[in-house]
C-alpha cells in the first residue's frame, strides 16, 4: 500500500505525506554546496483506531493501536516515514574537502503508521 | 547506534523503548492459537532539538527537527520503531485452516526518531 498524499491545504486528519522544501541556506548550513534546497516532504496526521489498510501500518502498529484503545498510557502509533530515498549532495567535510556523495534517508516517499 | 532502553517507571523524557506484553486473549483475538501473549515492546518519548546520536535518528528526522525549531507547523520527528522482528504464530486463517507462520514486524527491537 502507498499511504496517503496531501497538499498543505488538505483537511485530511489521518496520516499523510505533505510537501516540504528545505532551504539549507536559510538555516546557515553553508557547508552544503549543492543543492541549496530540496524537496524533503514530511509525515503528519492521526493513526486512529482501528488502523485501516491505506494507512500503511506495520503489524506492531495495529497491535499497539488496539492496546492504546483500552490503555491510553500506551501511545497510539505514529505517522512516520515508511519509505525514504537519498539525495546526491556536494558538501565540505570536516577537513574542508569537497565531497560528492549520496546521502541516505533525506526524502520522505511514503508515510504510514508505525 | 542502539537507541535508549527504559523500564516502565523511567523518568527519561527522550525517545526510548519500553516493555509491553500483549495478551491476545484479553482482546478477544481467539483465532490466534499460540502464543497467547508475547513481548511486543513500544516506543515513546520526545525527539528534542537538536537530535543527538543516541536517539538513532534518520537524516530526514534531523532536518525536520531543525525545521520544526523555526516553524512549529512542521511536526517534530516521532519516536518510532527503527528495528523490528517477527514472531512465529499458530493461527486460524479466514478459511478456518490452521496456519503456522512467521508474522513480520511484531516486536520492537529498537526505537529512534524518524
Amino acid at each position: 500500500d502507498f499511504g496517503l498524499d496531501c497538499d498543505e491545504h488538505s483537511t485530511e486528519s489521518r496520516c499523510c505525506r505533505y510537501p516540504l522544501t528545505v532551504d539549507f541556506e536559510a538555516f546557515g548550513w553553508d557547508w552544503i554546496i549543492a543543492p541549496k534546497r530540496y524537496k524533503a516532504n514530511y509525515c503528519s496526521g492521526e493513526c486512529p483506531f482501528p488502523l485501516a489498510d491505506h494507512l500503511n501500518s506495520t503489524n506492531h502498529a495495529i497491535v499497539q493501536t488496539l492496546v492504546n484503545s483500552v490503555n491510553s498510557k500506551i501511545p497510539k502509533a505514529c505517522c512516520t516515514p515508511t519509505k525514504m530515498s537519498p539525495i546526491n549532495m556536494l558538501y565540505f567535510n570536516g577537513k574542508e574537502q569537497i565531497i560528492y556523495g549520496k546521502i541516505p534517508a533525506m526524502v520522505v516517499d511514503r508515510c504510514g503508521c508505525s | 547506534d542502539f537507541g535508549l532502553d527504559c523500564d516502565e517507571h523511567s523518568t527519561e523524557s527522550r525517545c526510548c523503548r519500553y516493555p509491553l506484553t500483549v495478551d491476545f486473549e484479553a482482546f478477544g483475538w481467539d483465532w490466534i492459537i499460540a502464543p497467547k501473549r508475547y513481548k511486543a515492546n513500544y516506543c515513546s518519548g520526545e525527539c528534542p532539538f537538536p537530535l543527538a546520536d543516541h536517539l538513532n535518528s534518520t537524516n530526514h528526522a534531523i532536518v525536520q527537527t531543525l525545521v520544526n525549531s523555526v516553524n512549529s507547523k512542521i511536526p517534530k520527528a516521532c519516536c518510532t520503531p527503527t528495528k523490528m522482528s517477527p514472531i512465529n504464530m499458530l493461527y486460524f486463517n479466514g478459511k478456518e485452516q490452521i496456519i503456522y507462520g512467521k508474522i513480520p514486524a511484531m516486536v520492537v527491537d529498537r526505537c529512534g526518531c524518524s
Epitope: 501511545p75 | 523518568t11 523524557s13 518519548g45 520526545e46 528534542p48
Partner: antibody, heavy 122, light 107 residues
Framework: EVQLLESGGGLVQPGGSLRLSCAAS????????MSWVRQAPGKGLEWVSA????????YYADSVKGRFTISRDKSKNMLYLQMNSLRAEDTAVYYC???????????????WGQGTMVTVSS | EIVMTQSPATLSVSPGERATLSCRAS??????LVWYQQKPGQVPRLLIY???TRATGIPARFSGSGSGTEFTLTISSLQSEDFAVYYC?????????FGGGTKVEIK
C-alpha cells in the same frame, strides 16, 4: 522576568470538580515539560502530575490517577489540571512548576508559581 | 514507589555554623536527586540538582554530595536567610517523591 501564575483554586464539596490553570510569561512554556506539585497545609511537598514538551505523554501520582487530567494549550501558553471526584485529602496549595529536564529526565523544578489554594470540604 | 527519608526532622544551628542535612532513598536513585529550600509563606526554590550541581544563583556555601541511596546537603556557614525547610526529591523513577523535609532553625 520568568513567571508562572496559577488560578482556579477555591472551595469545593467532596466529589466536586475544579480546573486549575497556570499561565506562563517571560518564557515559552511549550518548550518545557511542566508539572503540578501540591502542599497540604503545614505538610510537605507532593508531586501530582507531569506533562511532556509535546503534551503527548502525561504522568500521574497514584493518589490522583483516574481523577486528575493534566493538559496544555500551546497557543495560549497555558497549563491545566482538571480535578474530578475531589476528596478532603486533596486539600492543598497547588503549584505549577517548570521542569529543567536535567539529564533529559523529568523532575527538576527550577521555576514555581505562587500556588493556588484548593479546599475540599462539605 | 521510592521512599525518601530526611533526617533530622529539625536541626538547631547557630548563625555561622555548618549544617549537615541527610536524605536516604529506599532504593538507588543514582545521582538523580534535587534539594529545595522553602521559607515560610514562600514557594520552593531549587538549590541543587544531579545530587551535587548548584542551580543558577545559588551561593557557594550550599553543596550537595552522595549517590545511590545516601545524600547530604551541607551549608558551610549558615546565614540568617538560610533558616528554612529543606526538601530532597528523587527524579530517577515515577512517581517523583519528596522527603518529609528538615527544618533548619536558629539555635
Amino acid at each position: 522576568e520568568v513567571q508562572l501564575l496559577e488560578s482556579g483554586g477555591g472551595l469545593v464539596q467532596p466529589g466536586g470538580s475544579l480546573r486549575l490553570s497556570c499561565a506562563a510569561s517571560g518564557f515559552t512554556s511549550i518548550t518545557y515539560a511542566m508539572s503540578w506539585v501540591r502542599q497540604a497545609p503545614g505538610k510537605g511537598l507532593e508531586w501530582v502530575s507531569a506533562i511532556s514538551v509535546s503534551g503527548t505523554n502525561t504522568y500521574y501520582a497514584d493518589s490522583v490517577k483516574g481523577r486528575f487530567t493534566i493538559s496544555r494549550d500551546k497557543s495560549k501558553n497555558m497549563l491545566y489540571l482538571q480535578m474530578n471526584s475531589l476528596r478532603a485529602e486533596d486539600t492543598a496549595v497547588y503549584y505549577c512548576a517548570k521542569d529543567l529536564l536535567h539529564n533529559w529526565k523529568y523532575g527538576t523544578f527550577d521555576i514555581w508559581g505562587q500556588g493556588t489554594m484548593v479546599t475540599v470540604s462539605s | 514507589e521510592i521512599v525518601m527519608t530526611q533526617s533530622p526532622a529539625t536541626l538547631s544551628v547557630s548563625p555561622g555554623e555548618r549544617a549537615t542535612l541527610s536524605c536516604r532513598a529506599s532504593q538507588s536513585v543514582d545521582s538523580n536527586l534535587v534539594w529545595y529550600q522553602q521559607k515560610p509563606g514562600q514557594v520552593p526554590r531549587l538549590l541543587i540538582y544531579g545530587a551535587s550541581t548548584r542551580a543558577t544563583g545559588i551561593p557557594a556555601r550550599f553543596s550537595g554530595s552522595g549517590s545511590g541511596t545516601e545524600f547530604t546537603l551541607t551549608i558551610s556557614s549558615l546565614q540568617s536567610e538560610d533558616f528554612a525547610v529543606y526538601y530532597c526529591q528523587q527524579y530517577n523513577k515515577w512517581p517523583l517523591t519528596f522527603g518529609g523535609g528538615t527544618k533548619v532553625e536558629i539555635k
